[in-house]
Interface confidence: low
């Protein structure tokens, strides 16, 4: 006769492991007992359980409550056992020894492999700011047995680097994602993808990128200087910028205080009916926690009466 078993039995942490051992004998042969032992190299064989044809199942105190026979119906030539709730320490070599009558004793070995699915964690790098060079955006670490695979899924351009640390029964893998921060990356997802044979599907952890920036400031409203004449109503200057965090705006006049009647409404400077008093240099100051920007414009309010007077003088001079 001969023993039928598996070279390797693979289970996920916490699952039940079936350790197969079936004696395929000639007609009339009987199995008297099946002994299961832990048979790791460098250690003496530690008995796990013994199935006796008359006295039933015996379990070592070290495995009490964790070793069972498969549910009925049972074949008397089947010496398989169930190891409940496999833990990482169960991983290793096992030996099945079958005592038969009249053929004698047979033995076979198998390896139990316990997969430990990873529990990944994602940690963001330092605050991202536009203008930085290559910067750590996030690192993702996963520990398991065997070593998990850690990759990144994102539309953001960047570089990855991985390192692995081997422990006695597992391995930790850390992957870092570096990028050169730009404002276009704001709000973009950066997803760590962890693959492992103990997982039914990849584990994905998403981090949303936040990149601080402040765009150059500019002022709109002076495109047509001829509109800035005495008496004009509804004249306004608007400061243009954008940033993350969203910026605040402040208006000042370089050559003195803001004239009375001029209204500041966030990014907009509203003027009452224009007079020559409104001529001057106006500064828009844009700032957020990241940076600040200034933009200044010169307002020159035209007085038609002054202009016509000048023209008359010129004519008379000729």
């Amino acid at each position: 006769g001969e023993l039928e078993t598996s070279d390797v039995v693979t289970v996920v942490l916490g699952q039940d492991a079936k350790l197969p051992c079936f004696y395929r004998g000639d007609s009339g042969e009987q199995v008297g007992q099946v002994a299961w032992a832990r048979a790791d190299a460098g250690e003496g064989a530690q008995e796990l359980a013994l199935l006796h044809s008359k006295y039933g199942l015996h379990v070592s105190p070290a495995y009490e409550g964790r070793v069972e026979q498969p549910p009925p119906p049972r074949n008397p030539l089947d010496g398989s056992v169930l190891l409940r709730n496999a833990v990482q320490a169960d991983e290793g070599e096992y030996e099945c020894r079958v005592s038969t009558f009249p053929a004698g004793s047979f033995q076979a070995r198998l390896r139990l492999r316990v997969l430990v699915p990873p529990l990944p964690s994602l940690n963001p790098g330092p605050a991202l700011e536009e203008g930085q060079g290559l910067t750590l955006a996030a690192s993702c670490t996963a520990e398991g047995s065997p070593a998990p695979s850690v990759t990144w899924d994102t539309e953001v351009k960047g570089t990855t680097s991985s390192r692995s640390f081997k422990h006695s029964r597992s391995a930790a893998v850390t992957s870092e994602f570096h990028l050169v921060p730009s404002r276009s990356m704001n709000g973009q997802p950066l997803t760590c993808v962890v693959s492992h044979p103990g997982l039914l599907q990849d584990q994905r952890i998403t981090h949303i990128l936040h990149v601080s920036f402040l765009a150059e400031a500019s002022v709109r409203g002076l495109e047509d200087q001829n509109l800035w004449h005495v008496g004009r109503e509804g004249a306004m200057l608007k400061c243009l910028s954008e940033g993350q965090p969203p910026p605040s705006y402040n208006w000042t006049r370089l050559d003195g205080p803001l004239p009375s009647g001029v209204r500041v409404d966030g990014d907009t400077l509203g003027f009452p009916p224009l007079t020559t008093e409104h001529s001057g240099i106006y500064v828009c100051h844009v700032s957020n926690e990241f940076s600040s920007r200034d933009s200044q414009v010169t307002v020159d309010v035209l007085d038609p009466q002054e202009d016509s007077g000048k023209q008359v003088d010129l004519v008379s001079a000729s």
Epitope: S121, N123, A138, I205, T206, H207
Partner: nanobody, 122 residues
């Protein structure tokens, strides 16, 4: 690992109401912030509202006064009551959650649900 399952989406007329629910399961002992994002066709995903375990809330300007987020910590469930719905609220709504790690350190691990579609149309 945390699993998030949304429900309550559907078709509603402008001005109508819907209530979305999101139940968390799995490794949920340390869920910190829960909330909702949405993504309209052809647009980027945007924050709608979030709520801490202590009940502090955050709303996008576009939904303030119309949407109300609430949370049942005992059942690890977050709700989004949406009133006075507008066509521009049409989007896939995603539940999100993060967790507190050991020693109370915030882990920026963000978990997402599969999304539930809200369509506002007459």
């Amino acid at each position: 690992q945390v699993q998030l399952v949304e429900s309550g989406g559907g078709l509603v007329q402008p001005g109508g109401s819907l209530r979305l629910s999101c139940a968390a399961s799995g490794s949920i002992f340390s869920i910190n912030v829960m909330g909702w994002y949405r993504q309209a066709p052809g647009k980027q995903r945007e924050l709608v509202a979030t709520i801490t375990s202590g009940g502090s809330v955050n709303y996008a300007d576009s939904v303030k006064g119309r949407f109300t987020i609430s949370r049942d910590n005992a059942n690890n469930t977050v709700y989004l009551q949406m009133n006075t719905l507008k066509p521009e609220d049409t989007a896939v709504y995603y539940c999100t959650a993060d967790q507190l790690g050991p020693l109370g350190l915030l882990s920026p691990t963000i978990y997402w649900g599969q999304g539930t579609l809200v369509t506002v149309s007459s």
